[in-house]
Structure formats: structure tokens, C-alpha cells
């Protein structure tokens, strides 16, 4: 039956650290004037902080960030023919993470 | 200016494959009837398909999925004292991925 599974192992916390994520290169990041083009590649890998912390007052946040420019191809369709151009997109990679206190409302004294 | 950075490397496509993601164990997964408890751990790692394909008509989809039960702690607060219980959450891991054609809307005949 659907309910019969293997023995449940104890769940391990997904610690706060960098993991590989997929970043979608939206066309509007390349050109806001028209949408009559394609971007290649449509997505790339980035390193991002993720995971959880011991309580809700702290969040997994990047403590070190690196900006990485990458070159993409902008493929314009002019009279049904592709014209290849280059464009630069700047990606944000997280290099280090930490469980940091969330900025909460300060008590009024 | 704000936009001056180092030389741009060619962007590499984030291929369609499994990557480690963080899955938040929401309280509603454990008990829909009350919210007067905590769950530990609050999040776990899962394997999920991500990345992009050659065109918009295909999407990165799992071709093989595995259900994995894990045991979490349900910490109920009764009269300001914690009562520890166990609960099982079934996680979905993707084992294999493929760029598959998106099912388009069928024309009404």
C-alpha cells in the first residue's frame, strides 16, 4: 500500500550553509525595451545561503558575498533571422553564511 | 559607477539535474488541529530536480522519485512545560531528471 515505507530515520537539520541554486536570467535583466529576443543560457548556477537556525529569531544570512559578471548571448530575431549579441549579467554568490538575529521591532522606551 | 566589475566569463547553463534543496517542515504537516507546538528540526535537505532546458516547451521534471520517511520531534507546550513526542514526515527525493515536453492546452474540438 501507499503507506508502507521503510523505517523512519531521525531527521537531520539542514544547516545554514551555501548550496547551489539555479538563477533564472530573465529577459528584462538584459533589455527592458523589447521582448523580441532570447537569452542563452536561460539559467545559471549560483551559490546561496540556505538552511535553518535554532529559533525563529535568527535567520541564515550571507556574511560574505561576491559579485560575478557572466556573459550571456542575446539572440535577437530580425526578419525571422537570429542576430547574436553579447550582454553581461552580474550574479550574486554567497561565500559564507551565519545564523544572524533578525532585525526586530525595538521596544519603545 | 555602480556597475564596474571584473571581466565577464561566459555563462554556463544550469543543467537539468538533481540538486540539494532545503525543505521546511511546517507545523501543518505534523498537526492541523493546533499550533501550540514546535517542530525539530524545522528544515531538512531533499534532492530535487532543477535547472533549465533548451527551450520553453520543455521543463526539467523528475523521472524517478523516492519517498523517504523521517522522524521529527513534536514539542508541545503544556502549562509552560515542554512535552516531547515523535512524528513522521514523508519527504520526496528526486532521483533522476529529464527535460520533458510541457503538456500544452489541447485545442477544444
Amino acid at each position: 500500500s501507499l503507506g508502507s515505507l521503510t523505517v523512519a530515520e531521525p531527521a537531520m537539520i539542514a544547516e545554514c550553509k551555501t548550496r547551489t541554486e539555479v538563477f533564472e536570467i530573465s529577459r528584462r535583466l538584459i533589455d527592458r525595451t523589447n521582448a523580441n529576443f532570447l537569452v542563452w543560457p536561460p539559467c545559471v548556477e549560483v551559490q546561496r545561503c540556505s538552511g535553518c537556525c535554532n529559533n525563529r529569531n535568527v535567520q541564515c544570512r550571507p556574511t560574505q558575498v561576491q559579485l560575478r559578471p557572466v556573459q550571456v548571448r542575446k539572440i535577437e530575431i530580425v526578419r525571422k533571422k537570429p542576430i547574436f549579441k553579447k550582454a553581461t549579467v552580474t550574479l550574486e554568490d554567497h561565500l559564507a553564511c551565519k545564523c544572524e538575529t533578525v532585525a526586530a521591532a525595538r521596544p519603545v522606551t | 559607477s555602480l556597475g564596474s566589475l571584473t571581466v565577464a566569463e561566459p555563462a554556463m547553463i544550469a543543467e537539468c539535474k538533481t540538486r540539494t534543496e532545503v525543505f521546511e517542515i511546517s507545523r501543518r504537516l505534523i498537526d492541523r488541529t493546533n499550533a501550540n507546538f514546535l517542530v525539530w528540526p524545522p528544515c531538512v535537505e531533499v534532492q530535487r530536480c532543477s535547472g533549465c532546458c533548451n527551450n520553453r516547451n520543455v521543463q526539467c521534471r523528475p523521472t524517478q522519485v523516492q519517498l523517504r520517511p523521517v522522524q521529527v520531534r513534536k514539542i508541545e507546550i503544556v502549562r509552560k512545560k515542554p512535552i516531547f513526542k515523535k512524528a513522521t514526515v514523508t519527504l520526496e527525493d528526486h532521483l533522476a531528471c529529464k527535460c520533458e515536453t510541457v503538456a500544452a492546452a489541447r485545442p477544444v474540438t
Epitope: F23, E24, I25, S26, R28, L29, R32, V46, R48, C49, R61, P62, V65, L67, T88, V89, T90, E92, H94 | S1, L2, G3, L5
Partner: antibody, heavy 120, light 107 residues
Framework: EVQLVESGGGLVQPGGSLRLSCAAS????????MSWVRQAPEKGLEWVST????????YYADSVKGRFTISRDNAKNSLYLQMNSLRAEDTAVYYC?????????????WGQGTLVTVSS | DIQMTQSPSSLSASVGDRVAITCRAS??????LNWYQQKPGKAPKLLIY???SLQSGVPSRFSGSGSGTDFTLTISSLQPEDFATYYC?????????FGGGTKVEIK
């Protein structure tokens, strides 16, 4: 269709706090830098804060530095502005705006705004 | 901080008129200049970015020019829906700053 909907505004006493939220839809929120811009009654536009797509970089106007904190939750397609130690001069309509990428620093799409009134 | 000065602060014009609004930066900002339109009770709307690029969906009667410190927003033939306040904004460096606005009114 791009949609940005702000909430959390209201009347607050000087020295008090508010948390503004902006719910985004109709675009890949996690790919865009986001900003808060404000407009005092019958005045011009004033940039408040900007956050990078991954949340690792934040920028503030001098007038709010140390009092306001911008943050985002890409899983929830949400942008936030935590406002502490509020002053009368913070009274304004607060707009959230999509700010393109690292080299753009513009305000491409805007929400309808939420009014913050700081008064005793 | 980079100061942005707009002129005139207000102008009266008729439908069909050609209208020009200028924006001057206190230092060179290359082409890092954007223009916005705002109608009463509404959020601003991006018209022109990078000094001369038209935002998608904006009518072609709007155009932008200039580089360095002096910039111009031109409306080639004013339409009834164009009566609004226009703002310039520099995106060269933080703090990001706006001009004081130009109110375009019906003559």
C-alpha cells in the same frame, strides 16, 4: 503581469516601529534587485533602500541608516522593510519597486504604495 | 551626494505641443539617468532608462537624450494622458537621487 502589493502601513507614534511587506507576483522575484522609495505628502520621491537579488547586499539612504532594515524572502516572493525609531519626517507613502539587476539601479515596476503616518 | 536639478518646476502646455524637460546632475553621471511619470494618487511609472532607452510599453512620443551632466525628456506631441509630474533619477552612485519634479499642466 507584474504585481507588487505593499502592506503594513498605518499610524504610529514617534519612536515606534512598523514592518512593511511587499508581495510580488508575475515575475521571477528571486532574479531581481528590489527597492523601497518613499514620497512625503505633496513632496517629491526619495530613495530609501535597495537589496540585491540574493539578499546579500543592502544599501540605505543616510536618513534611514541604522533605523531601517531591508530584507527579502525569495521562497515567499516577499520584500520587507523593518522601520524602527520612527520620526515625524518618516511620514510618507512607501513604495516597493523592482530594481532590475546590479547595473540598473532603477525602479522598473512599482506597487501602489502604503501610507505610514508618524504622529503623536 | 549627486544633486539632480530639474527645470522647469512646472509648465503649461496644450495637447499636440512638443514639450522638453531638462535635468542637470551636479557631477558627470555618464548615461545613468532614468525618467518617471507620476499621476496624482498613483505610483510612478518608468518611461526612459539609461538616458535614452524606452521602457517596454511606453509610447514612442517619449524620448530621452543627453550624457554627462545634462539630460532632456521630450514629449513630441503631448496627449491628454501625459499631464502629470515627471521625475529624473540618477543611478550612477548611491545614494540614488531624484530631481524635484516637473509638473506638466493643461494650458
Amino acid at each position: 503581469e507584474v504585481q507588487l502589493v505593499e502592506s503594513g502601513g498605518g499610524l504610529v507614534q514617534p519612536g515606534g516601529s512598523l514592518r512593511l511587506s511587499c508581495a510580488a507576483s508575475g515575475f521571477t522575484f528571486s532574479s531581481y534587485w528590489m527597492s523601497w522609495v518613499r514620497q512625503a505628502p505633496e513632496k517629491g520621491l526619495e530613495w530609501v533602500s535597495t537589496i540585491s537579488d540574493g539578499g546579500g547586499l543592502t544599501y540605505y539612504a543616510d536618513s534611514v541608516k541604522g533605523r531601517f532594515t531591508i530584507s527579502r524572502d525569495n521562497a515567499k516572493n516577499s520584500l520587507y522593510l523593518q522601520m524602527n525609531s520612527l520620526r515625524a519626517e518618516d511620514t510618507a507613502v512607501y513604495y516597493c519597486a523592482e530594481s532590475g539587476g546590479y547595473t540598473d539601479w532603477l525602479f522598473g515596476y512599482w506597487g501602489q504604495g502604503t501610507l505610514v503616518t508618524v504622529s503623536s | 551626494d549627486i544633486q539632480m536639478t530639474q527645470s522647469p518646476s512646472s509648465l503649461s502646455a496644450s495637447v499636440g505641443d512638443r514639450v522638453a524637460i531638462t535635468c542637470r546632475a551636479s557631477q558627470s553621471i555618464s548615461n545613468y539617468l532614468n525618467w518617471y511619470q507620476q499621476k496624482p494618487g498613483k505610483a510612478p511609472k518608468l518611461l526612459i532608462y539609461a538616458a535614452s532607452s524606452l521602457q517596454s510599453g511606453v509610447p514612442s512620443r517619449f524620448s530621452g537624450s543627453g550624457s554627462g551632466t545634462d539630460f532632456t525628456l521630450t514629449i513630441s506631441s503631448l496627449q491628454p494622458e501625459d499631464f502629470a509630474t515627471y521625475y529624473c533619477q540618477q543611478s550612477y552612485s548611491t545614494p540614488l537621487t531624484f530631481g524635484g519634479g516637473t509638473k506638466v499642466e493643461i494650458k
